[in-house]
């Protein structure tokens, strides 16, 4: 795969993943009422990071925000923080990667700068994806713990007055937002890895020439620190390098560029 295609694909995949992270963070269905093995209630409860909702059989839905910070579980606060950090890093990653895209020319930005920016955005996307995956996983773990605690309470008869009055124990299971978050985090992570891979292809080729120069004249030229730069004339500041890179770019541009990515 060409550098441009790899970079472009990485950008698009990260973008889709980032959009998913935002969607998951905003969604109300992080946890939904478990209906399995439960009496059929005419009320359906579900909760998000920011509010909890109740949908009645009548169709009436009421959502209430968590208007407190101190009263919320530390885990929920941690998940919120992780998702927000993921979003912030994703925004920065997108801004950096737009400038880093090989197909976009901005002034006289050389490939070494683009390579650095591509690597930076890739790392940002990787961290963003990891934040989302950790956030969602922490929440899922919290749900699993609470679920089994509720189940234990259910069967040990804790919810009743001397066993005479039954109470409906509302248990929560994984909501759609968790799956969206996992997939989105994974996509952002993959996109970030692709950007990092693309960075290697974008790296200025002076290092390659050093190697070639060394092997070609390995018997004749004595090694000395900085010697190759001096002998080849392909220092990081020279104009010649730019011309050579142009050749590499031409080869790259012959590859078919990714045009449209359909996703469901």
């Amino acid at each position: 795969m060409s550098v441009t295609a790899c970079q472009g694909l990485g950008f698009v995949v990260s973008l889709i993943g980032f959009a998913g992270i935002i969607a998951a963070t905003c969604m109300d269905q992080w946890s939904t009422q478990d209906l399995y093995n439960n009496p059929v209630t005419a009320v359906f409860n579900y909760q998000g990071l920011w509010r909890s909702c109740v949908r009645e059989s009548s169709g009436f839905t009421e959502c209430r925000g968590y208007f407190t910070l101190l009263g919320l579980p530390a885990m929920l606060q941690a998940v919120r923080a992780l998702m927000i950090v993921g979003i912030v890093l994703g925004v920065i990653g997108i801004l950096v990667s737009i400038f880093a895209l090989k197909c976009i020319r901005i002034g006289s930005m050389d490939d070494s700068a683009k390579a650095k920016m591509t690597l930076t955005s890739g790392i940002l996307f990787i961290i963003s994806g990891i934040c989302a995956i950790i956030g969602v996983s922490v929440f899922a773990n919290m749900l699993v713990t609470n679920f089994w605690m509720s189940t234990a309470n259910m069967y040990s008869g804790m919810g009743g007055m001397g066993g005479m009055v039954q109470t409906v124990q509302t248990r929560y299971t994984f909501g759609a937002a968790l799956f969206v978050g996992w997939v989105a985090g994974g996509l952002t992570l993959i996109g970030g890895v692709m950007m990092c891979i693309a960075c290697r292809g974008l790296t200025p080729d002076d290092s390659n020439f050093k190697a070639v120069s060394y092997h070609a004249s390995g018997q004749n030229v004595a090694y000395r620190p900085g010697g190759f730069k001096a002998s080849t004339g392909f220092g990081s500041n020279t104009r010649n390098k730019k011309i050579y890179d142009g050749g590499a770019r031409t080869e790259d541009d012959e590859q078919s560029h990714p045009t449209k990515y359909d996703y469901v």
């Epitope: 059929v40 009320v43 409860n45 009645e56 009548s58 409906v168 509302t170």
Partner: antibody, heavy 118, light 113 residues
Framework: EVQLQQSGPELVKPGASVKMSCKAS????????IHWVKQKPGQGLEWIGY????????KYNEKFKGRATLTSDKSSSTAYMEFSSLTSEDSAVYYC???????????WGQGTSVTVSS | DIVMTQSPSSLTVTVREKVTLSCKSS????????????LTWYQQKPGQPPKLLIY???TRESGVPDRFTGSGSGTDFTLTISSVQAEDLAVYYC?????????FGAGTKLELK
């Protein structure tokens, strides 16, 4: 003004079927679930089930499952209940009611009286 | 199924008297998600369909006089008529609207002394 207009009284023979209607007006029919309730003469109320006019999805009280069939017609904003294999125990007034928030039945039809007699 | 138990089955009252009707459910009708009790109260006069008075155990339906007050939580609920009027003589039903099948109490008949 919200209204639920039910069909007239029915006199049927044991073992027969009866289909009654409940025509809604004054609101968007598909936005509210319609419930059906049975009341025997001089007795209390018994929930039969509901029909969701938006999805045409019914839900039944196990006691009436198999004998009661709830349907709806969006075009005429009408809900229907068909009752089969009637016995004298089914002689009652049948009400349709609209479900609103709090799962409360806020508007009721005037009732359809069904008499099962040979 | 949830069993709704109303007491008393009938009550003889005088006009302007304060009346308390009781309703107990075999299971809690409190939904933890919104801390609301899914219990409704209806009034039924002879030859008429039931009329909604109270939903969410304590929320008065619009148009219902404020002498009608619903209270209680979990399994024990109360309908209070602060000052009975002649037009309040009817049968009062409580209903579970939390767990299917929706079930009604047997009713409390309010009669004039």
């Amino acid at each position: 003004e919200v209204q639920l207009q039910q069909s007239g009284p029915e006199l049927v023979k044991p073992g027969a079927s009866v289909k009654m209607s409940c025509k809604a007006s004054g609101y968007t029919f598909t936005n509210y679930i319609i419930h059906w309730v049975k009341q025997k003469p001089g007795q209390g109320l018994e929930w039969i089930g509901y029909i969701n006019p938006y999805t045409d999805g019914p839900k039944y009280n196990e006691k009436f499952k198999g004998r009661a069939t709830l349907t709806s017609d969006k075009s005429s904003s009408t809900a229907y209940m068909e009752f089969s294999s009637l016995t004298s125990e089914d002689s009652a007034v049948y009400y349709c009611a609209r479900l609103n928030r709090g799962n409360a039945m806020d508007y009721w039809g005037q009732g359809t009286s069904v008499t099962v007699s040979s | 199924d949830i069993v709704m138990t109303q007491s008393p089955s009938s009550l003889t009252v005088t006009v302007r008297e304060k009346v308390t009707l009781s309703c107990k459910s075999s299971q809690s009708l409190l939904n933890s998600g919104n801390q609301k009790n899914y219990l409704t109260w209806y009034q039924q006069k002879p030859g008429q369909p039931p009329k909604l008075l109270i939903y969410w155990a304590s929320t008065r339906e619009s148009g219902v006089p404020d002498r009608f007050t619903g209270s209680g939580s979990g399994t024990d609920f109360t309908l209070t008529i602060s000052s009975v009027q002649a037009e309040d003589l009817a049968v009062y039903y409580c209903q579970n609207v939390y767990i299917y099948p929706f079930t009604f109490g047997a009713g409390t008949k309010l009669e004039l002394k």
